[in-house]
């Protein structure tokens, strides 16, 4: 089982790459493969729960071919996750001690083979389209988790899922501020890496409560938020689609990013 490796700051950097071509599957649409851990602890999903977790976040469980294509495009993650064929794998570009798996010191997608469905791991999900827009929301006092839910709903939107954030990231959403997502996690999308934004690679960063990269933020702690509005939703009064809306009150300051 691959280890967590050293905890850098208090965030986990998921390098996520767009899958644009898969050998033998030339018509696969562009999309994103991402590692997903919906709860506060590592390796907690059975195979069935893994499939459901991807669906809940607006994605589907990834296929081995999709993970392989992501690996070939530079994707690395030292966390074992379920795939669609009930195998458990993880992609390693730069082999290191806790992540060697079945490949010794060679790069490649590590595999544990087909595993019993009751064993628990993380999951790799795939999302290929975003039928709407993700926008970053904030205000002076920011939001508890419940307030974030209510804020998004009051602006004709819902709190974005992790899958929606990954899809928006793949289409250019870049924000160096972590925000609430629908599963209670705290994440932020980085297209252009910079020192103050958690690492030297593009990706969606996950913020954990503890230095060992476990724990979700408390729902009563205050943070920004990412909202999602479906394509059919009507813009709020004072808002122009794709632009920066007029602030509904003197306190709120929110930014809409068309993706």
């Amino acid at each position: 089982t691959p280890g967590l490796g050293p905890a850098t700051a208090f965030t986990s950097e998921d390098l996520v790459v767009q899958v644009t071509a898969v050998p033998g599957q030339p018509h696969l649409p562009g999309g994103v493969v991402f590692h997903y851990r919906p709860g506060p602890t590592r390796y907690s999903l059975t195979f069935e729960e893994a499939q459901q977790a991807c669906l809940r976040t607006g994605a589907v469980i990834a296929s081995p071919e999709q993970l392989q294509a992501a690996y070939e495009a530079g994707y690395e993650q030292c966390d074992a996750g379920w795939l669609r064929d009930q195998t458990v794998r993880y992609p390693i570009v730069s082999p290191r001690t806790p992540c060697v798996g079945d490949k010794d010191s060679s790069p490649g997608v590590r595999t544990y083979g087909v595993r019993p469905s009751t064993e628990t791991y993380d999951v790799y999900c795939f999302v290929d389209r975003l039928e709407g827009e993700v926008f970053f929301a904030t205000r002076l006092e920011q939001f508890t988790f419940q307030e974030a839910l209510e804020f998004c709903e009051s602006h004709n939107a819902t709190l974005a899922t992790t899958g929606q954030l990954y899809a928006a990231w793949s289409r250019g959403l870049d924000k160096c501020y972590a925000g609430w997502l629908a599963d209670g996690s705290l994440r932020y999308p980085i297209v252009t890496p910079r020192p103050a934004c958690g690492g030297d690679k593009p990706g969606v960063r996950t913020v954990y409560l503890y230095p060992n990269q476990t724990g979700l933020p408390d729902p009563l702690s205050r943070h920004h938020a990412f909202c999602f509005r479906g394509i059919s939703a009507v813009p709020s009064p004072g808002e122009e689609e794709g632009g920066t809306p007029t602030s509904p009150s003197g306190v709120e300051e929110w930014i809409v990013t068309q993706v």
């Epitope: 965030t11 006092e141 702690s221």
Partner: nanobody
Framework: EVQLVESGGGLVQPGGSLRLSCAAS????????MYWYRQAPGKQRELVAS???????NYADSVKGRFTISRDNAKNTVYLQMNSLKPEDTAVYYC?????????WGQGTQVTVSS
Amino acid sequence: EVQLVESGGGLVQPGGSLRLSCAASGSIFSNRFMYWYRQAPGKQRELVASITLSGSTNYADSVKGRFTISRDNAKNTVYLQMNSLKPEDTAVYYCNTFLQNSFYWGQGTQVTVSS
């Protein structure tokens, strides 16, 4: 570097009071939300109280009416006044803040409520 240093813990009898302090690095304090968490032996760390930039406060149901969080921006310090203490308040109390997409913790201060 972000530093949070708690003090004020100790042994107190049931019904007694304690005031915890958390001194924060000056550069981060005045514009940050601040939190007090606690962790009892064998239990998960839980959020006890929070205070926003404007001084708005929130409390866990278990401490409402007994604990008060406050801040002194001039002293870069956040306080937790704990009254009517109960044995179940025994825990290590931690100061916490969130800065540049990271959570930061103090080292904790032990509070023991026992007769």
